[in-house]
Amino acid sequence: EEELQVIQPDKSVLVAAGETATLRCTATSLIPVGPIQWFRGAGPGRELIYNQKEGHFPRVTTVSDLTKRNNMDFSIRIGNITPADAGTYYCVKFRKGSPDDVEFKSGAGTELSVRAKPSAPVVSGPAARATPQHTVSFTCESHGFSPRDITLKWFKNGNELSDFQTNVDPVGESVSYSIHSTAKVVLTREDVHSQVICEVAHVTLQGDPLRGTANLSETIRVPPTLEVTQQPVRAENQVNVTCQVRKFYPQRLQLTWLENGNVSRTETASTVTENKDGTYNWMSWLLVNVSAHRDDVKLTCQVEHDGQPAVSKSHDLKVSAHPKEQGSNTAAENTGSNERNIY
Protein backbone atom coordinates (compact mmCIF):
# COMPACT_ATOMS: atom_id res chain seq x y z
CA GLU A 1 0.00 0.00 0.00
CA GLU A 2 1.14 3.53 -0.82
CA GLU A 3 2.65 5.50 2.07
CA LEU A 4 0.36 7.99 3.75
CA GLN A 5 0.49 11.57 2.47
CA VAL A 6 -0.82 14.59 4.34
CA ILE A 7 -2.59 16.90 1.91
CA GLN A 8 -3.16 20.59 2.69
CA PRO A 9 -4.85 21.69 -0.55
CA ASP A 10 -4.83 25.43 0.21
CA LYS A 11 -1.47 27.15 0.02
CA SER A 12 -3.08 30.24 1.50
CA VAL A 13 -6.32 31.30 3.11
CA LEU A 14 -7.54 34.88 3.54
CA VAL A 15 -9.99 35.57 6.37
CA ALA A 16 -11.56 38.76 7.72
CA ALA A 17 -10.92 39.58 11.37
CA GLY A 18 -13.74 38.26 13.57
CA GLU A 19 -14.64 35.48 11.14
CA THR A 20 -13.83 31.76 11.19
CA ALA A 21 -10.87 30.31 9.27
CA THR A 22 -11.15 26.82 7.80
CA LEU A 23 -7.82 25.02 7.42
CA ARG A 24 -8.21 21.94 5.25
CA CYS A 25 -6.24 18.73 5.69
CA THR A 26 -6.77 15.16 4.53
CA ALA A 27 -4.72 11.97 4.84
CA THR A 28 -4.46 9.51 1.95
CA SER A 29 -4.44 6.41 4.19
CA LEU A 30 -5.63 5.16 7.57
CA ILE A 31 -2.23 3.63 8.24
CA PRO A 32 -0.19 4.16 10.34
CA VAL A 33 -2.53 4.54 13.30
CA GLY A 34 -1.99 7.72 15.27
CA PRO A 35 -3.34 11.19 15.92
CA ILE A 36 -3.19 14.39 13.94
CA GLN A 37 -1.91 17.64 15.41
CA TRP A 38 -2.05 21.13 14.00
CA PHE A 39 0.82 23.58 14.52
CA ARG A 40 1.61 27.16 13.65
CA GLY A 41 5.21 27.36 12.46
CA ALA A 42 7.56 24.62 11.37
CA GLY A 43 10.49 24.51 13.78
CA PRO A 44 10.83 23.30 17.36
CA GLY A 45 9.35 26.58 18.56
CA ARG A 46 6.10 25.84 16.74
CA GLU A 47 2.85 26.52 18.57
CA LEU A 48 0.31 23.75 19.14
CA ILE A 49 -3.05 24.76 17.67
CA TYR A 50 -4.94 21.49 17.98
CA ASN A 51 -4.20 18.03 19.34
CA GLN A 52 -6.63 15.26 18.48
CA LYS A 53 -5.69 13.33 21.62
CA GLU A 54 -5.71 15.89 24.42
CA GLY A 55 -5.57 19.56 25.39
CA HIS A 56 -7.71 22.65 25.61
CA PHE A 57 -8.42 24.44 22.32
CA PRO A 58 -11.54 26.56 22.84
CA ARG A 59 -11.39 28.33 19.48
CA VAL A 60 -10.83 25.19 17.40
CA THR A 61 -13.45 22.78 16.08
CA THR A 62 -13.00 19.88 13.69
CA VAL A 63 -14.88 19.83 10.41
CA SER A 64 -15.61 16.10 10.59
CA ASP A 65 -15.91 13.56 13.40
CA LEU A 66 -12.35 12.49 14.18
CA THR A 67 -13.56 9.64 16.39
CA LYS A 68 -14.91 7.73 13.37
CA ARG A 69 -12.62 4.86 12.48
CA ASN A 70 -12.41 5.52 8.76
CA ASN A 71 -12.08 9.32 9.01
CA MET A 72 -9.35 10.84 6.87
CA ASP A 73 -10.48 14.49 7.02
CA PHE A 74 -8.53 16.40 9.65
CA SER A 75 -9.63 19.92 8.67
CA ILE A 76 -10.18 22.42 11.47
CA ARG A 77 -12.01 25.70 11.98
CA ILE A 78 -10.51 28.49 14.10
CA GLY A 79 -13.09 30.99 15.36
CA ASN A 80 -12.93 34.73 15.98
CA ILE A 81 -9.78 35.30 13.93
CA THR A 82 -7.58 38.31 14.76
CA PRO A 83 -4.49 39.67 12.96
CA ALA A 84 -2.35 37.93 15.62
CA ASP A 85 -3.48 34.56 14.18
CA ALA A 86 -1.63 35.13 10.90
CA GLY A 87 1.06 32.58 10.10
CA THR A 88 1.69 29.23 8.43
CA TYR A 89 -0.30 26.29 9.79
CA TYR A 90 0.83 22.68 9.44
CA CYS A 91 -1.25 19.55 9.70
CA VAL A 92 1.02 16.81 11.11
CA LYS A 93 0.34 13.06 11.31
CA PHE A 94 1.82 11.15 14.26
CA ARG A 95 2.41 7.43 14.52
CA LYS A 96 1.30 5.74 17.71
CA GLY A 97 4.30 5.05 19.90
CA SER A 98 5.32 4.21 23.42
CA PRO A 99 5.63 6.19 25.58
CA ASP A 100 5.17 9.06 23.12
CA ASP A 101 3.72 9.28 19.63
CA VAL A 102 6.27 9.89 16.90
CA GLU A 103 5.94 12.54 14.20
CA PHE A 104 5.35 10.75 10.91
CA LYS A 105 4.50 13.22 8.15
CA SER A 106 3.61 16.88 7.76
CA GLY A 107 1.46 18.70 5.27
CA ALA A 108 2.99 21.45 3.13
CA GLY A 109 1.40 24.18 5.24
CA THR A 110 -1.35 26.74 4.73
CA GLU A 111 -0.57 30.42 5.14
CA LEU A 112 -3.35 32.19 6.98
CA SER A 113 -3.62 35.91 6.18
CA VAL A 114 -6.03 38.08 8.09
CA ARG A 115 -7.94 40.99 6.66
CA ALA A 116 -8.55 43.55 9.38
CA LYS A 117 -10.41 46.84 9.10
CA PRO A 118 -8.64 50.08 9.89
CA SER A 119 -9.77 51.89 13.01
CA ALA A 120 -11.78 55.09 12.57
CA PRO A 121 -9.33 57.80 11.47
CA VAL A 122 -8.52 60.31 14.20
CA VAL A 123 -7.73 63.81 12.96
CA SER A 124 -5.93 66.27 15.20
CA GLY A 125 -4.96 69.84 14.53
CA PRO A 126 -2.37 72.23 15.94
CA ALA A 127 -2.18 72.86 19.68
CA ALA A 128 -2.50 76.64 19.25
CA ARG A 129 -4.85 78.69 17.09
CA ALA A 130 -3.54 80.39 13.96
CA THR A 131 -4.72 83.35 11.93
CA PRO A 132 -5.77 83.52 8.27
CA GLN A 133 -3.00 83.24 5.65
CA HIS A 134 -1.04 80.97 7.97
CA THR A 135 -0.37 77.32 7.12
CA VAL A 136 -1.30 74.78 9.77
CA SER A 137 -0.70 71.03 9.98
CA PHE A 138 -3.30 68.34 10.61
CA THR A 139 -2.50 64.73 11.37
CA CYS A 140 -4.60 61.66 10.68
CA GLU A 141 -4.02 58.24 12.22
CA SER A 142 -5.63 54.86 11.70
CA HIS A 143 -4.47 51.52 13.08
CA GLY A 144 -4.87 47.76 13.04
CA PHE A 145 -5.51 47.08 9.36
CA SER A 146 -4.32 44.25 7.17
CA PRO A 147 -3.28 43.79 4.39
CA ARG A 148 -0.90 46.75 4.13
CA ASP A 149 -2.35 48.37 1.00
CA ILE A 150 -4.44 51.42 1.94
CA THR A 151 -5.42 54.76 0.41
CA LEU A 152 -5.67 58.00 2.34
CA LYS A 153 -7.06 61.29 1.02
CA TRP A 154 -7.47 64.74 2.57
CA PHE A 155 -10.32 67.16 1.86
CA LYS A 156 -11.18 70.68 2.91
CA ASN A 157 -14.89 71.40 2.47
CA GLY A 158 -15.11 68.67 -0.17
CA ASN A 159 -12.08 69.86 -2.12
CA GLU A 160 -9.22 67.38 -2.24
CA LEU A 161 -5.93 68.56 -0.77
CA SER A 162 -2.57 67.75 -2.33
CA ASP A 163 -0.03 68.97 0.23
CA PHE A 164 0.32 65.98 2.56
CA GLN A 165 2.74 63.21 3.51
CA THR A 166 1.72 59.69 4.46
CA ASN A 167 3.55 56.78 6.10
CA VAL A 168 2.41 53.20 6.62
CA ASP A 169 4.16 51.31 9.42
CA PRO A 170 5.88 48.96 9.65
CA VAL A 171 7.70 48.80 6.34
CA GLY A 172 8.02 44.99 6.36
CA GLU A 173 5.82 42.02 7.18
CA SER A 174 3.47 42.45 10.12
CA VAL A 175 0.21 41.07 11.45
CA SER A 176 -1.33 44.55 11.19
CA TYR A 177 -0.40 48.04 10.07
CA SER A 178 -0.87 51.71 10.96
CA ILE A 179 -1.11 54.79 8.76
CA HIS A 180 -0.04 58.31 9.72
CA SER A 181 -0.53 61.32 7.49
CA THR A 182 0.20 65.03 7.89
CA ALA A 183 -1.56 67.61 5.73
CA LYS A 184 -0.82 71.31 5.39
CA VAL A 185 -3.79 73.67 5.21
CA VAL A 186 -3.74 77.42 4.46
CA LEU A 187 -6.33 79.24 6.58
CA THR A 188 -8.64 81.92 5.19
CA ARG A 189 -10.95 84.38 6.97
CA GLU A 190 -13.95 82.32 5.83
CA ASP A 191 -12.76 79.08 7.50
CA VAL A 192 -14.72 79.24 10.76
CA HIS A 193 -17.33 76.86 9.29
CA SER A 194 -14.76 74.80 7.34
CA GLN A 195 -13.96 71.15 7.94
CA VAL A 196 -10.86 69.12 7.21
CA ILE A 197 -11.60 65.49 6.40
CA CYS A 198 -9.25 62.50 6.30
CA GLU A 199 -10.63 59.62 4.27
CA VAL A 200 -9.25 56.08 4.45
CA ALA A 201 -10.08 53.39 1.86
CA HIS A 202 -9.17 49.73 2.43
CA VAL A 203 -10.13 46.41 0.87
CA THR A 204 -12.01 45.44 4.05
CA LEU A 205 -14.32 48.46 3.81
CA GLN A 206 -15.98 47.33 0.55
CA GLY A 207 -15.91 50.74 -1.09
CA ASP A 208 -17.29 52.57 1.95
CA PRO A 209 -14.33 54.62 3.22
CA LEU A 210 -13.88 55.69 6.83
CA ARG A 211 -13.68 59.40 7.60
CA GLY A 212 -12.25 61.47 10.38
CA THR A 213 -12.97 65.17 10.65
CA ALA A 214 -11.62 68.27 12.31
CA ASN A 215 -13.48 71.57 12.50
CA LEU A 216 -11.34 74.57 11.63
CA SER A 217 -13.31 76.49 14.25
CA GLU A 218 -11.03 74.73 16.75
CA THR A 219 -7.94 75.96 14.90
CA ILE A 220 -8.61 79.39 13.47
CA ARG A 221 -8.43 82.80 15.10
CA VAL A 222 -9.86 85.67 13.06
CA PRO A 223 -8.65 88.95 14.57
CA PRO A 224 -11.21 91.76 14.75
CA THR A 225 -11.27 94.95 12.77
CA LEU A 226 -12.04 98.08 14.82
CA GLU A 227 -13.85 101.25 13.89
CA VAL A 228 -14.43 104.12 16.31
CA THR A 229 -17.07 106.69 15.32
CA GLN A 230 -18.61 109.69 16.94
CA GLN A 231 -22.43 109.69 16.91
CA PRO A 232 -24.62 112.79 16.86
CA VAL A 233 -24.81 114.62 20.17
CA ARG A 234 -27.45 113.11 22.47
CA ALA A 235 -27.65 116.01 24.91
CA GLU A 236 -26.01 119.40 24.96
CA ASN A 237 -22.85 118.22 26.76
CA GLN A 238 -22.79 114.52 25.82
CA VAL A 239 -21.17 112.81 22.87
CA ASN A 240 -21.84 109.18 22.02
CA VAL A 241 -18.75 107.34 20.72
CA THR A 242 -19.08 103.78 19.43
CA CYS A 243 -16.47 101.09 18.84
CA GLN A 244 -17.51 98.58 16.19
CA VAL A 245 -15.64 95.27 16.63
CA ARG A 246 -16.17 93.27 13.46
CA LYS A 247 -15.47 89.82 12.04
CA PHE A 248 -13.71 88.15 14.96
CA TYR A 249 -13.50 84.52 16.08
CA PRO A 250 -13.60 82.96 18.64
CA GLN A 251 -15.95 85.03 20.80
CA ARG A 252 -13.53 85.51 23.71
CA LEU A 253 -12.94 89.25 23.68
CA GLN A 254 -12.37 92.04 26.20
CA LEU A 255 -12.72 95.73 25.38
CA THR A 256 -11.31 98.66 27.32
CA TRP A 257 -12.16 102.35 26.78
CA LEU A 258 -9.40 104.84 27.52
CA GLU A 259 -9.84 108.59 27.88
CA ASN A 260 -6.54 110.36 27.30
CA GLY A 261 -4.80 107.13 28.19
CA ASN A 262 -6.74 106.51 31.40
CA VAL A 263 -8.97 103.47 31.71
CA SER A 264 -12.59 104.45 31.66
CA ARG A 265 -14.30 101.07 31.43
CA THR A 266 -13.56 97.42 30.67
CA GLU A 267 -16.16 94.99 29.42
CA THR A 268 -16.39 91.49 28.01
CA ALA A 269 -18.19 90.71 24.76
CA SER A 270 -21.51 89.14 25.64
CA THR A 271 -24.42 89.79 23.31
CA VAL A 272 -22.62 89.40 20.00
CA THR A 273 -24.15 89.01 16.57
CA GLU A 274 -23.03 86.17 14.35
CA ASN A 275 -22.17 86.65 10.70
CA LYS A 276 -22.94 84.14 7.96
CA ASP A 277 -19.29 83.07 7.86
CA GLY A 278 -19.31 82.20 11.58
CA THR A 279 -17.40 85.28 12.74
CA TYR A 280 -18.87 87.70 15.28
CA ASN A 281 -19.60 91.43 15.47
CA TRP A 282 -19.96 93.47 18.60
CA MET A 283 -20.45 97.13 19.42
CA SER A 284 -19.60 99.07 22.53
CA TRP A 285 -20.40 102.70 23.13
CA LEU A 286 -19.32 105.40 25.49
CA LEU A 287 -21.15 108.58 26.53
CA VAL A 288 -18.62 111.31 27.05
CA ASN A 289 -19.48 114.36 29.11
CA VAL A 290 -17.51 116.94 27.19
CA SER A 291 -18.15 119.67 29.77
CA ALA A 292 -15.79 117.84 32.11
CA HIS A 293 -12.91 118.40 29.74
CA ARG A 294 -11.04 121.65 29.11
CA ASP A 295 -9.03 120.26 26.21
CA ASP A 296 -9.61 117.85 23.33
CA VAL A 297 -10.15 114.23 24.37
CA LYS A 298 -8.37 111.24 22.85
CA LEU A 299 -10.69 108.24 23.12
CA THR A 300 -9.17 104.81 22.56
CA CYS A 301 -11.01 101.55 22.06
CA GLN A 302 -8.59 98.80 23.06
CA VAL A 303 -9.48 95.17 22.34
CA GLU A 304 -7.82 92.02 23.64
CA HIS A 305 -9.00 89.09 21.57
CA ASP A 306 -8.53 85.45 22.58
CA GLY A 307 -5.57 86.20 24.83
CA GLN A 308 -3.61 87.97 22.08
CA PRO A 309 -1.82 91.33 22.44
CA ALA A 310 -4.29 94.19 22.47
CA VAL A 311 -5.19 96.10 19.32
CA SER A 312 -6.63 99.60 19.51
CA LYS A 313 -8.24 102.38 17.53
CA SER A 314 -8.38 106.01 18.67
CA HIS A 315 -10.69 108.92 18.02
CA ASP A 316 -9.98 112.58 18.80
CA LEU A 317 -12.92 114.38 20.31
CA LYS A 318 -12.80 118.16 19.86
CA VAL A 319 -14.22 119.89 22.92
CA SER A 320 -13.30 123.55 22.21
CA ALA A 321 -16.69 124.30 20.64
CA HIS A 322 -18.64 123.10 23.72
CA PRO A 323 -19.39 125.39 26.67
CA LYS A 324 -17.87 124.24 29.95
CA GLU A 325 -20.39 123.20 32.55
CA GLN A 326 -19.32 124.07 36.06
CA GLY A 327 -19.39 121.63 38.95
CA SER A 328 -19.57 118.45 36.92
CA ASN A 329 -17.22 115.79 38.16
CA THR A 330 -18.36 112.93 35.95
CA ALA A 331 -16.30 112.81 32.81
CA ALA A 332 -18.15 109.96 31.13
CA GLU A 333 -21.28 107.95 31.43
CA ASN A 334 -20.45 104.39 30.45
CA THR A 335 -22.89 102.51 28.34
CA GLY A 336 -22.46 99.01 27.01
CA SER A 337 -23.86 97.53 23.85
CA ASN A 338 -26.85 96.27 25.79
CA GLU A 339 -28.11 99.87 25.99
CA ARG A 340 -28.11 100.02 29.82
CA ASN A 341 -26.67 103.03 31.56
CA ILE A 342 -24.20 102.41 34.35
CA TYR A 343 -24.01 105.16 36.98
Partner: antibody, heavy 117, light 108 residues
Framework: DVQLVESGGGVVRPGESLRLSCAAS????????MNWVRQAPGEGLEWVSL???????YYADSVKGRFTISRDNSKNTLYLQMNSLRAEDTAVYYC???????????WGLGTLVTVSS | EIVLTQSPGTLSLSPGERATLSCRAS??????LAWYQQKPGQAPRLLIY???TRATGIPDRFSGSGSGTDFTLTINRLEPEDFAVYYC??????????FGGGTKVEIK
Protein backbone atom coordinates in the same frame (compact mmCIF):
# COMPACT_ATOMS: atom_id res chain seq x y z
CA ASP B 1 -1.19 38.31 32.36
CA VAL B 2 1.66 35.99 31.37
CA GLN B 3 3.98 35.21 34.28
CA LEU B 4 7.11 33.09 34.47
CA VAL B 5 8.72 32.58 37.88
CA GLU B 6 12.04 30.75 38.20
CA SER B 7 13.29 29.08 41.38
CA GLY B 8 15.96 26.62 42.51
CA GLY B 9 19.09 28.70 42.01
CA GLY B 10 21.85 28.80 44.56
CA VAL B 11 25.54 28.22 45.27
CA VAL B 12 27.05 24.80 44.49
CA ARG B 13 30.53 23.33 44.09
CA PRO B 14 31.89 22.19 40.74
CA GLY B 15 30.62 18.72 39.84
CA GLU B 16 27.42 19.09 41.88
CA SER B 17 23.83 19.21 40.64
CA LEU B 18 20.94 21.64 40.80
CA ARG B 19 17.36 21.56 39.53
CA LEU B 20 15.70 24.76 38.34
CA SER B 21 11.93 25.18 38.06
CA CYS B 22 9.81 27.70 36.18
CA ALA B 23 6.16 28.12 37.12
CA ALA B 24 4.07 29.45 34.22
CA SER B 25 0.68 31.16 34.27
CA UNK B 26 -1.48 33.37 32.07
CA UNK B 27 -1.29 31.24 28.91
CA UNK B 28 -1.92 27.67 27.76
CA UNK B 29 1.46 26.28 28.77
CA UNK B 30 1.14 22.99 26.85
CA UNK B 31 0.68 24.83 23.54
CA UNK B 32 4.06 26.56 23.52
CA UNK B 33 7.70 25.59 23.35
CA MET B 34 9.73 26.73 26.38
CA ASN B 35 13.39 27.67 26.80
CA TRP B 36 16.15 28.31 29.24
CA VAL B 37 18.47 31.23 28.44
CA ARG B 38 21.38 32.21 30.67
CA GLN B 39 23.51 35.27 31.26
CA ALA B 40 26.91 35.09 32.94
CA PRO B 41 27.79 38.12 35.13
CA GLY B 42 28.51 41.12 32.91
CA GLU B 43 28.09 39.03 29.75
CA GLY B 44 25.52 38.64 26.98
CA LEU B 45 22.61 36.25 26.50
CA GLU B 46 23.24 32.57 25.74
CA TRP B 47 20.49 30.17 24.72
CA VAL B 48 20.70 26.94 26.75
CA SER B 49 17.85 24.60 25.91
CA LEU B 50 14.39 24.24 24.35
CA UNK B 51 11.56 21.76 24.85
CA UNK B 52 8.94 21.68 22.11
CA UNK B 53 5.20 21.14 22.54
CA UNK B 54 5.77 17.50 21.62
CA UNK B 55 8.49 17.26 24.31
CA UNK B 56 11.38 17.11 21.83
CA UNK B 57 14.47 18.58 23.46
CA TYR B 58 17.35 20.68 22.13
CA TYR B 59 20.55 21.83 23.84
CA ALA B 60 23.46 24.20 23.33
CA ASP B 61 26.72 22.34 22.74
CA SER B 62 28.13 23.77 25.99
CA VAL B 63 25.55 21.90 28.13
CA LYS B 64 24.79 18.82 26.03
CA GLY B 65 25.00 15.62 28.09
CA ARG B 66 24.99 17.49 31.40
CA PHE B 67 21.67 19.39 31.39
CA THR B 68 18.18 17.95 30.92
CA ILE B 69 15.11 20.04 30.12
CA SER B 70 11.64 18.70 30.89
CA ARG B 71 8.08 19.93 31.35
CA ASP B 72 5.02 18.94 33.33
CA ASN B 73 2.00 20.30 31.49
CA SER B 74 -0.34 19.27 34.29
CA LYS B 75 1.59 21.55 36.67
CA ASN B 76 2.38 24.27 34.09
CA THR B 77 6.03 23.91 35.07
CA LEU B 78 9.31 23.82 33.16
CA TYR B 79 12.44 22.22 34.65
CA LEU B 80 16.18 22.23 34.05
CA GLN B 81 18.20 19.47 35.70
CA MET B 82 21.83 20.58 35.79
CA ASN B 83 24.47 17.94 36.51
CA SER B 84 28.29 18.09 36.58
CA LEU B 85 28.19 21.83 37.05
CA ARG B 86 31.24 23.90 36.13
CA ALA B 87 32.42 27.38 37.11
CA GLU B 88 31.52 28.59 33.61
CA ASP B 89 27.87 27.65 34.24
CA THR B 90 27.65 30.52 36.75
CA ALA B 91 24.90 32.76 35.43
CA VAL B 92 21.39 34.08 35.86
CA TYR B 93 19.09 31.47 34.28
CA TYR B 94 15.97 32.80 32.60
CA CYS B 95 12.91 30.80 31.66
CA UNK B 96 11.47 32.14 28.37
CA UNK B 97 8.40 31.39 26.30
CA UNK B 98 9.02 31.21 22.56
CA UNK B 99 6.54 32.06 19.81
CA UNK B 100 5.88 30.06 16.64
CA UNK B 101 8.14 32.48 14.75
CA UNK B 102 11.04 32.05 17.19
CA UNK B 103 10.71 35.12 19.36
CA UNK B 104 11.25 35.16 23.10
CA UNK B 105 8.13 37.15 23.95
CA UNK B 106 7.98 36.53 27.71
CA TRP B 107 10.79 36.08 30.22
CA GLY B 108 10.99 35.34 33.92
CA LEU B 109 13.04 37.51 36.25
CA GLY B 110 15.75 34.85 36.43
CA THR B 111 17.41 32.76 39.15
CA LEU B 112 21.11 33.00 39.97
CA VAL B 113 23.26 29.87 39.85
CA THR B 114 26.77 30.21 41.28
CA VAL B 115 29.28 27.39 40.82
CA SER B 116 32.30 27.98 43.02
CA SER B 117 34.76 25.92 45.00
CA GLU C 1 26.50 28.33 12.61
CA ILE C 2 25.63 32.00 12.07
CA VAL C 3 27.49 34.58 14.16
CA LEU C 4 25.90 37.95 14.99
CA THR C 5 28.35 40.80 15.65
CA GLN C 6 27.03 43.94 17.32
CA SER C 7 28.76 47.29 17.18
CA PRO C 8 29.72 49.47 18.85
CA GLY C 9 30.20 47.71 22.17
CA THR C 10 29.23 50.90 24.02
CA LEU C 11 27.47 54.02 22.79
CA SER C 12 27.70 57.17 24.95
CA LEU C 13 24.91 59.62 24.19
CA SER C 14 22.79 62.31 25.81
CA PRO C 15 19.00 62.23 26.21
CA GLY C 16 17.33 63.59 23.08
CA GLU C 17 20.07 62.32 20.77
CA ARG C 18 19.67 59.56 18.19
CA ALA C 19 21.21 56.13 18.77
CA THR C 20 22.20 53.90 15.84
CA LEU C 21 23.07 50.30 16.72
CA SER C 22 24.44 47.79 14.24
CA CYS C 23 24.08 44.02 14.01
CA ARG C 24 25.99 42.11 11.32
CA ALA C 25 25.32 38.47 10.43
CA SER C 26 28.11 36.19 9.19
CA UNK C 27 25.81 35.03 6.38
CA UNK C 28 22.50 36.29 4.91
CA UNK C 29 19.44 35.77 7.14
CA UNK C 30 16.71 37.45 5.04
CA UNK C 31 14.65 39.65 7.37
CA UNK C 32 14.52 37.27 10.32
CA LEU C 33 16.11 39.48 12.94
CA ALA C 34 14.80 40.58 16.33
CA TRP C 35 16.01 43.13 18.88
CA TYR C 36 15.72 42.99 22.67
CA GLN C 37 16.28 45.61 25.37
CA GLN C 38 17.68 44.72 28.79
CA LYS C 39 17.88 47.14 31.70
CA PRO C 40 20.13 46.44 34.71
CA GLY C 41 18.66 43.79 37.00
CA GLN C 42 15.79 43.06 34.61
CA ALA C 43 14.94 40.38 32.07
CA PRO C 44 15.24 41.18 28.36
CA ARG C 45 12.21 42.62 26.57
CA LEU C 46 11.29 42.03 22.94
CA LEU C 47 11.43 45.31 20.96
CA ILE C 48 11.40 44.53 17.26
CA TYR C 49 11.01 41.43 15.10
CA UNK C 50 11.12 40.61 11.38
CA UNK C 51 13.73 43.42 11.18
CA UNK C 52 11.17 46.27 11.23
CA THR C 53 8.05 45.31 13.20
CA ARG C 54 7.66 46.83 16.66
CA ALA C 55 6.40 44.46 19.35
CA THR C 56 3.22 45.37 21.22
CA GLY C 57 3.58 48.49 23.35
CA ILE C 58 6.94 49.57 21.94
CA PRO C 59 7.05 53.34 21.23
CA ASP C 60 7.63 54.49 17.66
CA ARG C 61 10.95 56.16 18.49
CA PHE C 62 12.35 52.61 18.10
CA SER C 63 12.76 51.49 14.50
CA GLY C 64 14.57 48.69 12.74
CA SER C 65 15.97 48.41 9.23
CA GLY C 66 18.26 46.30 7.08
CA SER C 67 18.27 42.98 5.24
CA GLY C 68 20.62 40.19 4.33
CA THR C 69 23.60 40.62 6.65
CA ASP C 70 23.43 44.24 7.85
CA PHE C 71 20.78 45.38 10.30
CA THR C 72 20.23 48.57 12.31
CA LEU C 73 18.24 49.53 15.37
CA THR C 74 17.59 53.28 15.58
CA ILE C 75 16.33 55.05 18.67
CA ASN C 76 15.20 58.58 17.85
CA ARG C 77 15.29 61.14 20.66
CA LEU C 78 16.68 59.00 23.48
CA GLU C 79 14.58 59.04 26.63
CA PRO C 80 16.17 58.42 30.07
CA GLU C 81 14.53 54.97 30.19
CA ASP C 82 16.19 53.95 26.89
CA PHE C 83 19.66 53.67 28.41
CA ALA C 84 20.16 49.90 28.50
CA VAL C 85 21.83 46.99 26.70
CA TYR C 86 20.41 45.96 23.32
CA TYR C 87 20.73 42.48 21.79
CA CYS C 88 19.94 41.24 18.31
CA UNK C 89 18.72 37.67 17.69
CA UNK C 90 18.41 35.56 14.57
CA UNK C 91 14.82 34.31 14.33
CA UNK C 92 15.87 30.99 12.85
CA UNK C 93 13.52 27.99 12.98
CA UNK C 94 16.00 25.62 14.58
CA UNK C 95 18.16 25.84 17.70
CA UNK C 96 20.64 26.94 18.72
CA UNK C 97 19.07 30.37 18.94
CA UNK C 98 21.77 32.96 18.33
CA PHE C 99 22.11 36.31 20.09
CA GLY C 100 24.55 39.09 19.32
CA GLY C 101 27.04 40.19 21.98
CA GLY C 102 25.05 43.32 22.86
CA THR C 103 25.49 47.10 22.66
CA LYS C 104 25.36 49.18 25.80
CA VAL C 105 23.74 52.60 25.38
CA GLU C 106 24.94 54.75 28.28
CA ILE C 107 24.41 58.35 29.34
CA LYS C 108 27.24 60.63 28.22
Amino acid sequence: DVQLVESGGGVVRPGESLRLSCAASGFTFSNFAMNWVRQAPGEGLEWVSLISVTATTYYADSVKGRFTISRDNSKNTLYLQMNSLRAEDTAVYYCAKVTWNNLFDYWGLGTLVTVSS
Amino acid sequence: EIVLTQSPGTLSLSPGERATLSCRASQPIDSYLAWYQQKPGQAPRLLIYNTVTRATGIPDRFSGSGSGTDFTLTINRLEPEDFAVYYCQHQYDWPPYIFGGGTKVEIK
